[in-house]
């Protein structure tokens, strides 16, 4: 946030940039949390826009019995590996076809034992406040589907009648990693020393990191004709004086008519 300064007073302004603001020859360049001619004001909203999507990665192991292991399978650029990868990917795409969050599989390692396939199942969902539940449900469905296929697609009398056959006992889920996104934590961190006064409110499932000085939210502070200003002790209303009234009180809701005060003073004189 920047405020431009013109005229002779600018040089003085330069040395007075506050809150870590820097002078660029024309104006104070303010850090994220501040604005104003001298970076003296605290912003009332901080952009903590969530990522568009949240990802999860499941580390799985399955044992393929319909392919004979050879040393070439360890070499990811070999024809053996490339063909295995193609078929394994096709098979897994069929297995997980009913899961909207499914993105694909990534083979990390092939080792002996028929062919033990260490791989990641990649999941992704659009960000909503319920993303954890969505991805948790998807990982459960992945477990169900891989367990089912590795139980059903097995060699019978040394014959595999499917695209791939598996060893039922070789299926394991090693680890599940979900990208962490915590808007409350992000909001608190980005608000720094004002963290106690900034909160997250949702609008159209999007999180907004706001202080009570931001209008239009349930936590918004109504300063009436005054101006809401954030300080280290919290949000405060700075009350204005008009031609006719002085305003005071916690929310600048108490107006005193100047003429009455002046009249009162004249009375004493």
């Amino acid at each position: 946030r920047t405020t431009t300064c013109f005229g002779d007073g600018c040089q003085n302004t330069a040395s007075r940039c506050k809150n870590g603001g820097t002078w660029d020859g024309l104006k104070c360049q303010c850090p994220n949390l501040y604005y104003g001619e001298l970076c003296e004001e605290v912003v009332s909203s901080i952009d903590i826009g969530p990522p568009e999507t949240i990802s999860a990665q499941m580390e799985l192991t399955v044992t393929v019995t319909s392919v004979k292991f050879t040393e070439e399978l360890k070499n990811h650029s070999s024809q053996e590996f490339q063909e295995f990868k193609q078929t394994f990917t096709e098979q897994m795409n069929i297995v997980y076809s009913g899961i909207p969050e499914y993105v694909g599989v990534n083979i990390t390692k092939l080792r002996l034992g028929s062919v033990v396939v260490e791989h990641d199942v990649l999941l992704r969902t659009k960000y909503t406040p319920e993303y954890k539940t969505v991805l948790d449900n998807a990982t459960e469905v992945v477990k169900e589907k891989i367990t089912k296929v590795t139980t059903q697609q097995i060699m019978i009398n040394d014959i595999c009648s499917d695209m791939m056959c598996f060893n039922t006992t070789g299926t394991q889920v090693q680890n599940i990693t979900v990208t962490q996104y915590d808007p409350e934590e992000d909001c608190r961190k980005m608000a720094k020393e004002y963290g106690d006064y900034f909160v997250v409110e949702y609008r159209d499932q999007k999180p907004y990191c706001i202080s009570p000085c931001e209008p239009g939210f349930s936590v918004s502070k109504n300063c009436n004709l005054g101006k809401c200003q954030m300080s280290l002790s919290g949000p405060q209303c700075l009350c204005v004086t008009t031609e006719t009234h002085w305003y005071s009180g916690e929310t600048c809701n108490q107006g005193t008519q100047k003429s009455l005060v002046y009249g009162h003073h004249h009375h004493h004189h």
């Epitope: 319909s66 053996e80 040394d158 595999c160 009648s161 695209m163």
Partner: nanobody, 124 residues
Framework: EVQLVESGGGLVQPGRSLRLSCAAS???????MGWFRQAPGKEREGVAG???????GYADSVKGRFTISKDNAKNSLYLQMNSLRAEDTALYSC???????????????????RGQGTMVTVSS
């Protein structure tokens, strides 16, 4: 990648024989190989399959009449078709599995390489 090219198709009278060939551009030694066919307006079906170790399998409709074989040295697959019937009319294509595929005595395995096919018409 393995390229497969079929040949040997044509018009033949019922009861006669035909031999189909399939030339592969790469090594077929460690692959399961198979023949499929698709009659006009019908689903593709497995006709015959041969494993890396030479064990064969046939669809019930062709057992005793068709013979699958392969020549590893020539990287070629063959289908000898005897006592042909009108219902054998179809586009015949050969297919190859991934390397080191085992347990493919039957025909339902989805091969990853497939040729364009050669047409066989059985009609008097």
């Amino acid at each position: 990648e393995v390229q497969l090219v079929e040949s040997g198709g044509g018009l033949v009278q019922p009861g006669r024989s035909l031999r189909l060939s399939c030339a592969a551009s790469g090594d077929i030694t460690r692959r399961c190989m198979g023949w499929f066919r698709q009659a006009p307006g019908k689903e593709r079906e497995g006709v015959a399959g041969i494993s890396e170790d030479g064990i064969t399998g046939y669809a019930d409709s062709v057992k005793g009449r068709f013979t699958i074989s392969k020549d590893n040295a020539k990287n070629s697959l063959y289908l000898q078709m005897n006592s042909l019937r009108a219902e054998d009319t179809a586009l015949y294509s050969c297919a190859a599995s991934i390397l080191n595929r085992v347990g493919c005595r039957q025909l339902s395995y989805e091969y990853i390489y497939r040729g364009q096919g050669t047409m066989v018409t059985v009609s008097s």
